[in-house]
């Protein structure tokens, strides 16, 4: 049975086996095509989601689709139902929390009262001034809180108490990539993790431990990427994995927050990376223990210099490392989070690519998560 499962796939009607390597190869080998059903699926970037959250105290902004202008949501007459609608528009299914926060003196968007029309937030026509003098601060999910704060040092062993969102993504029980829990159903990782194996069946997620082998595996229902472009293989290196059953959160299993749409991190901003990846470039071995390291944002201009990546780092990517080199993510860390701490932890980057590991002029390159918020929300909405 184990050998059969490992090398063969059972087609139904009529029942017969096909070699597992024929799964997800673009050919219908089973009469009903089920060999092409549970495969990595691509999902287009889609339309603009008409709500977003700002780094200014997680305040809600709403798009006027007629003009293309964004407006800040006034707290006047804002209700739990409106909060739920806003979060559903971003694909969240959990119960949101919201509060009033005073409008700051530098408020740059017009402030409008919000209403609802066919499950979408709208601006109330001729709403008048914002009488509360307050904006809506909205949290769709409790996220980004860990039991333990890491110490700021170079590279050290990590505890799952510090990083309860970190998961190991495994194929045939072998660790391939890292990933981050975003909510009970969804894990964020890198698309390139699935280039070799595009069948969903054999992929598993392990959560809740900092030791590679010691935690139960979770079945995966779907793996979703953006269209792969062979001309630009490093682009759109982002994937979402939908778990078959929702996670139960605990001290060691918790979600990390997505970044705000306007989360612009300046060079030298401190960040953290974690993973079970190779401890040495071209060799060494996969670490059994989760490792953590503090790094910082490296300026994109510096990262694209002639002695570095020569223009390969696009605006949907970001670089992080330490100027003198020596601290970096490596093979096996791919898909894991690049994290920033404000009030909560946010996943600002996904471990993506780089030349070598830890070189001074070639730091790690990460998928910039804020560039893909729209895509994430559209995927979640489609799967609600």
């Amino acid at each position: 049975k184990v050998i059969l499962d490992k090398y063969y796939f059972l087609c139904g009607q009529p029942l017969h086996f096909i070699p597992r390597k024929q799964l997800c190869d673009g050919e219908l080998d089973c009469p009903l095509g089920e060999d092409e059903e549970h495969c990595v699926k691509s999902f287009p970037e889609g339309p603009a989601v008409a709500v977003r959250l700002s780094k200014d105290r997680s305040t809600l902004q709403v798009l006027d689709s007629a003009t293309g202008n964004w407006f800040s949501a006034c707290f006047d007459n804002f209700t739990e139902a409106l909060a739920e609608t806003a979060c559903r528009q971003m694909g969240y299914s959990s119960k949101p929390t919201f509060r009033a926060v005073e409008i700051g003196p530098d408020q740059d968007l017009d402030v409008v009262e919000i209403t609802e029309n066919s499950q979408e937030l709208r601006m109330r026509n001729s709403s008048g001034p914002c009488l509360s003098g307050s904006l809506v601060s909205l949290h769709c999910l409790a996220c980004g809180k860990s039991l333990k704060t890491p110490r700021v040092v170079g590279v050290e062993e990590a505890s799952v108490d510090s990083w309860p969102w970190q998961v190991s993504i495994q194929y045939d029980k072998q660790h391939v990539c890292g990933g981050s829990i975003l909510d009970p159903h969804w894990v964020l990782t890198a698309a390139h993790c699935f280039r070799k194996h595009t069948d969903v069946f054999n992929w598993k997620v392990r959560a809740g431990s900092d030791k590679l082998g010691s935690f139960p595996s979770l079945a995966v229902a779907k793996i979703i990427i953006i269209e792969f472009n062979p001309m630009y293989p490093k682009d759109n290196d982002i994937a979402l994995m939908k778990l078959q059953f929702p996670l139960t959160f605990s001290g060691t299993v918790r979600p990390i927050c997505l970044p705000f749409f306007d989360e612009e991190l300046t060079p030298a901003t401190p960040l953290w990376i974690i993973g079970w990846g190779f401890t040495k470039q071209n060799g060494g071995k996969m670490s059994d223990i989760l490792l953590q390291a503090s790094v910082q944002v490296i300026d994109s201009t510096r990262c694209n210099a002639d002695d570095a990546y020569q223009g390969e780092v696009t605006e949907k990517m970001m670089c992080a490392g330490i100027p003198e080199g020596g601290v970096d993510t490596c093979q096996g860390d791919s898909g894991g989070p690049l994290m920033y701490q404000s009030d909560q932890w946010h996943v600002v980057g996904i471990v993506s690519w780089g030349y070598g590991c830890g070189g001074p002029s070639t730091p790690g390159v990460y998928t910039k998560v804020s560039a893909y918020l729209n895509w994430i929300y559209n995927v979640w909405k489609a799967e609600l």
């Epitope: 006047d76 007459n77 009033a100 005073e102 003196p105 001034p129 009488l131 509360s132 003098g133």
Partner: antibody, heavy 116, light 108 residues
Framework: QVQLVQSGAEVKKPGSSVKVSCKAS????????ISWVRQAPGQGLEWVGG????????NYAQKFQGRVTITADESPSTAYMELSSLRSEDTAVYYC?????????WGQGTLVTVSS | EIVMTQSPATLSVSPGERATLSCRAS???????LAWYQQKPGQAPRLLIY???TRATGIPARFSGSGSGTEFTLTISSLQSEDFAVYYC?????????FGQGTKVEIK
């Protein structure tokens, strides 16, 4: 449309206190700010302070700090402004209004006269 | 605190004429929090314009506001008899929020 009804005129002695009430009807009391503005006879408008009932905390203009207390009670949808250590120059009409940075609905005003 | 200075103190205009009222802030304010009020004798003030240029509900189109930074203007394009009153500007950017001393628009 929110309507604000204020308490009646008061005559007070110097050194005493006065408490003016402002009852709101229409709209959700907890979701808008209430501000207090005063106007001395023949003079312009002067900001006293304001409160957001949902926060419960009030802001006061520096000039009145320590002498004024603004509170709000959600169950009768009423805001209050208490001014202590009254002096003759506090003689004015005191208005409550909905809003914080722009004041939309105004009460009819309460004349407070401070005289010995 | 920010001082709001209005000019002129009194403006004498004939009905049907245009009136232009000025308000100057002692330092730059966010135009989103600049409002104009009208007050008639024995009445509470009434909000005319907020956000420097947006008319409040029910305010006739003859009232318009403009300006940014430190210079703001209220224009009444064709004065009606009911427009003769005192007009105040108010900044809501920096605490404490402050009013101008008022401009009285009277019949010429």
């Amino acid at each position: 449309q929110v309507q604000l009804v204020q308490s009646g005129a008061e005559v007070k002695k110097p050194g005493s206190s006065v408490k003016v009430s402002c009852k709101a009807s229409g709209g959700t009391f907890s979701s808008y700010a209430i501000s207090w503005v005063r106007q001395a006879p023949g003079q312009g408008l002067e900001w006293v302070g304001g409160i957001m009932p949902i926060f419960g905390t009030a802001n006061y203009a520096q000039k009145f700090q320590g002498r004024v207390t603004i509170t709000a009670d959600e169950s009768p949808s009423t805001a209050y402004m208490e001014l202590s250590s009254l002096r003759s120059e506090d003689t004015a009409v005191y208005y409550c209004a909905t809003g914080r940075r722009e004041l939309l609905n105004w009460g009819q005003g309460t004349l407070v006269t401070v005289s010995s | 605190e920010i001082v709001m200075t209005q000019s002129p103190a009194t403006l004498s205009v004939s009905p049907g004429e245009r009136a232009t009222l000025s308000c100057r802030a002692s330092q730059s304010v966010n135009s989103r929090f600049l409002a104009w009020y009208q007050q008639k004798p024995g009445q509470a003030p009434r909000l005319l314009i907020y956000g420097a240029s947006t008319r409040a509900t029910g305010i006739p189109a003859r009232f318009s506001g403009s300006g940014s930074g430190t210079e703001f203007t209220l224009t009444i394009s064709s004065l009606q008899s009911e427009d003769f009153a005192v007009y105040y500007c108010m900044q809501g950017t920096h605490w404490p929020y402050t009013f101008g001393q008022g401009t009285k628009v009277e019949i010429k």
